[in-house]
Interface confidence: medium
């Protein structure tokens, strides 16, 4: 960052999107600012308009191509600059040499579905979205189940230390409404972080058969 009160954080979704957040203490809300991306190995550059997301932070998405196109590799360096208009000129507010595969945050898993549900267990599957083929199987997942009367924050995390796009939830209560979420993270990258949580999948366990213990 150009000065100590500025914070500029970006993540690559591993395919064709770099999402950035810039925060600056004391910056004017109505200032027009952009993120400029200049890859060192590519014959393109890209710009996105920073839009306010809070009192002192702005965000934008650099769309590098079609969602599943592989636009960057592990040896690309993208110089990212925050440029803000000052009168008729542009002033550089922040800069970073962005290494895409060191700063990964994948898209949230999609297509969650109940494969099979019983009284005490439920098998759920999902798919990863817009994830690079470079990862092969080097991904991990976290999942959580929302039980009645609890919050998501209270839900214990289940970790899948391999690329496993399904889970069998055990020891559930019969005839009970649950919600399920999953997120994904590549093993690669010093500053890589978890994807957002998936949209919750609601399901209900089957009622216990009459005359049987629960």
């Amino acid at each position: 960052a150009v000065n100590g009160t500025s914070r500029f954080t970006c993540f690559y979704n591993s395919r064709a999107n770099i999402s950035c957040v810039w925060s600056q203490d004391g910056a004017l809300q109505d200032t027009s600012c952009q993120v400029h991306a200049w890859p060192d190995r590519r014959r393109w550059n890209q710009t996105c308009e920073l839009l306010p997301v809070s009192q002192a932070s702005w965000a934008c998405n650099l769309i590098l191509g079609t969602p599943d196109s592989q636009k960057l590799t592990a040896v690309d360096i993208v110089t990212l600059r925050v440029m803000c208009r000052e009168g008729v000129r542009w002033r550089m507010m922040a800069i970073q040499d962005f290494k895409p595969f060191e700063n990964l945050r994948l898209m949230a898993p999609i297509s969650l579905q109940v494969v099979h549900v019983e009284t005490h267990r439920c098998n759920i599957s999902w798919k990863i979205s817009q994830a690079s083929h470079y990862f092969e199987r080097h991904l991990e997942f976290e999942a959580r189940t929302l039980s009645p009367g609890h919050t998501w924050e209270e839900a214990p995390l289940m970790t899948l230390k391999q690329k496993q796009e399904w889970i069998c939830l055990e020891t559930l209560t019969p005839d009970t409404q649950y919600e399920f979420q999953v997120r994904v993270k590549p093993l690669q990258g010093e500053f890589t972080t978890w994807s957002p949580w998936s949209q919750p999948l609601a399901f209900r366990t089957k009622p216990a058969a009459l005359g049987k213990d629960t």
């Epitope: 200049w38 890859p39 060192d40 190995r41 590519r42 014959r43 590799t73 592990a74 040896v75 360096i77 110089t79 990212l80 800069i95 970073q96 040499d97």
Partner: antibody, heavy 119, light 106 residues
Framework: EVQLLESGGGLVQPGGSLRLSCAAS????????VHWIRQAPGKGLEWLGA???????QYNAAVKGRFTISRDNSKNTLYLQMNSLRAEDTAVYYC?????????????WGQGTLVTVSS | DIQMTQSPSSLSASVGDRVTITCQAS?????LYWYQQRPGKAPRLLIY???NLASGVPSRFSGSGSGTSYTFTISSLQPEDIATYYC?????????FGQGTKVEIK
Amino acid sequence: EVQLLESGGGLVQPGGSLRLSCAASGFSVTSYGVHWIRQAPGKGLEWLGAIWSGGSTQYNAAVKGRFTISRDNSKNTLYLQMNSLRAEDTAVYYCARAGDYNYDGFAYWGQGTLVTVSS
Amino acid sequence: DIQMTQSPSSLSASVGDRVTITCQASQSVSFLYWYQQRPGKAPRLLIYDTSNLASGVPSRFSGSGSGTSYTFTISSLQPEDIATYYCQQWSTYPLTFGQGTKVEIK
């Protein structure tokens, strides 16, 4: 016209230090990555590291910790600081810049400066 | 690190001959470059991105290949082509070069 001019080479004793300079003209060092490459006498080329346009650096593990790349934007000059020099560091040292995109390879080279490490 | 192995390490050919140099990578690479280095001079870029001719380079030079196997060709050797030729990968860091192929005139 893009030009790179290395200087600072010479004779240094083992264990000593030396700072090489690479004066750039025809472009701004804040807009392009610049690399250091060396060639031992009668040998092939070895990539040492680079400083990117935003100022961050990348090194070959073979020299990381002993060699440091830096730059002075106001002088449009790059530096290679070499410490704890060994006989095997004897080489011609080049700075190089890719074309407008690195896909274009090392399109621009300096003339090289000779470093001799010997007692 | 990716090892780049050139063959032959040296060759002698007559003016007008077709000369071929191969470069084998220890693992698959996507971006390959070829340089010419005359004695006492800095390297000069000839081929970028596997097969593209650098600015001002004569069309007798060409490159091809993919994956781990690449080829550099001089279609008709000229006296000024006496030099050492290097391949280089830019698919992963550290960047690495082949050991060089010295080309001489018979």
